[in-house]
């Protein structure tokens, strides 16, 4: 039975040209995290494998940096980066947990962070 929950940074906004950290946290389970995949819609951004390290998709190499932790840093943001991002936790023995973050990249100089929320 999957008992874990994923806490994410929720709905967030950032300025065009700036950077943002995407963070998820898996709690309420003793399952071992084998790998975390970061995806944007159907595109793989990056992988953090617990044993082997990071893989950054070649098309995002210039704008994506590993970390902090299992998180992901997006740099040189454009308006086209607006959309849904998913952290997919591969765990053993529970299976897969998915968290969702919505990022809005703003043209203006004011970007406020949304509140945290949980996905069961």
């Amino acid at each position: 039975m999957m008992t874990g929950t994923i806490e994410t940074t929720g709905n967030i906004s950032a300025e065009k040209g700036g950077s943002i950290i995407l963070q998820c946290h898996l709690s309420s389970t003793t399952a071992q995290v084998t790998q975390v995949n970061w995806e944007q819609q159907d595109q793989l951004l990056a992988i953090c494998n617990a044993d082997l390290g990071w893989h950054i998709s070649p098309s995002f190499k210039d704008r994506v940096a590993p970390g902090p932790g299992l998180g992901l840093t997006l740099q040189s943001l454009t308006v086209n980066d607006t959309g849904e991002y998913f952290c997919i936790y591969h765990t053993y023995p529970d299976g897969t947990y998915t968290g969702r973050i919505f990022l809005e990249v703003l043209e203006s100089s004011v970007a406020e962070h949304g509140a945290r929320f949980q996905i069961p």
């Epitope: 084998t34 790998q35 617990a50 044993d51 082997l52 390290g53 990071w54 970390g67 053993y92």
Partner: antibody, heavy 116, light 107 residues
Amino acid sequence: EVQLLESGGGLVQPGGSLRLSCAASGFTFSNYGVSWVRQAPGKGLEWVSWISPHGALTYYADSVKGRFTISRDNSKNTLYLQMNSLKAEDTAVYYCAKGRRRFDYWGQGTLVTVSS
Amino acid sequence: DIQMTQSPSSLSASVGDRVTITCRASQTISSYLNWYQQKPGKAPKLLIYENNNRPSGVPSRFSGSGSGTDFTLTISSLQPEDFATYYCQQSYIIPPTFGQGTNVEIK
């Protein structure tokens, strides 16, 4: 005590196949990802492949992708490496190794020789 | 893939000498740098992990330092059992990659 014991090496012709095994003991095998690392005679170390604890995730070095298949049988505490379309440059001692962000336990290795 | 370059490729030293081996990564690897010792006909043995941590049983004369792209393994006082080949390995970016090795020989 953690032990990893490889077997299945030998002499094989180019284009041939071989299956290596690694028997694990001294730890809960099903909780850990495991890798194969090889070393050509007189050369350095090269990571070959990795498999997750449950076997759902695998990675391969570009040099073996499409030719080698890593698998595991947790009920037998055994790791496998199926090697097809072998080339002379696959000649090496093959080690199984475990560890998170490091290889802290290694087997003694099994020698694979690809030659006609 | 990240290239790991060790120097020197070999060195001759005497018992009691202080020995330094360097490893350079082709891009930053944070502190995810491991060192291994290998003796002829044997499997590699982990000496240092994540730059400066020693597994239990590894003597304190072995130490690691550095960060980013440049790392060093130091043997403070070389012992007879330390004559071997030493490899660095990065575990920051997949695939894991090793240096070409440094052979420490008896002078």
